[in-house]
Amino acid sequence: LPAPKNLVVSEVTEDSARLSWTAPDAAFDSFLIQYQESEKVGEAIVLTVPGSERSYDLTGLKPGTEYTVSIYGVKGGHRSNPLSAIFTT
């Protein structure tokens, strides 16, 4: 299963960030977004968004904090390889 492409983190504020990515139409049933403060373990947050979406706003983030985010495409119950990025609020 090919991964989504071109993950961009934009509009970063002290407590939010916009994720956007590309994928062929109807390539995935949904996208799984996982993010966590980079310096912590056991804190990963998992979100699912519809396969028709190509952006998502992360909210409730902590100011001045580095985050690691990964996005996976999901099709027929199978998960693609991830596309990952690191950003700081």
Epitope: Q34, K40, I86
Partner: antibody, heavy 117, light 112 residues
Framework: QVTLKESGPGILQPSQTLSLTCSFS??????????VGWIRQPSGKGLEWLAH???????GYNPALKSRLTISKNTSSNLVFLKIASVDTADTATYYC?????????WGQGTSVTVSS | NIMMTQSPSSLAVSAGEKVTMNCKSS????????????LAWYQQKPGQSPKLLIY???TRESGVPDRFTGSGSGTDFILTISNVQAEDLAVYYC????????FGSGTKLEIK
Amino acid sequence: QVTLKESGPGILQPSQTLSLTCSFSGFSLNTSGTGVGWIRQPSGKGLEWLAHIWWDDDKGYNPALKSRLTISKNTSSNLVFLKIASVDTADTATYYCVRIKGRMDYWGQGTSVTVSS
Amino acid sequence: NIMMTQSPSSLAVSAGEKVTMNCKSSQSVLFGSKQKNYLAWYQQKPGQSPKLLIYWASTRESGVPDRFTGSGSGTDFILTISNVQAEDLAVYYCHQYLSLFTFGSGTKLEIK
């Protein structure tokens, strides 16, 4: 040299609040990326994570026990505390505190707690 | 919650043999730009507290003999002990530390 040592009441009665203390040395909870957690193990059984606290005072709790747990710290004294409210016999276990830094890398020797009427 | 399933629950081998034990997570514990598996293995000898052997699924903790090897990725992991010694008598737990913290129920290693 990193060390952690747990202390507790030993024995307490059902419905009481269990208060545990973790005293540690060899690291600081002022250091970014560092946390301390609590794990318990009933005799002859497996390991169960209870709670953890980070250098920045973020806390995490086992969802099944969250309503009964309170974790806190005294950074300057190198102490972490865990309170478990309304204990019953199912809370009888050995309680361990652990350092978390990228992984749970150092464990205390454990303190045995018995809940009995 | 991510559930961790270990197998077998116990096994017995003779000293000098090689042993493998399995751990399966209910969802992938692979995460991040560096593609790390948030999976550790612990050894708990009778009457002692657990000791970290392996983290990031395959990185040996300092001081751990190289006969302990961790492998696997995603949801399926293996701990291999080559040339088993009498002092390896213990229960071995796998543990995920990606989303909260959960442990497997353990594999008890006995020496024949």
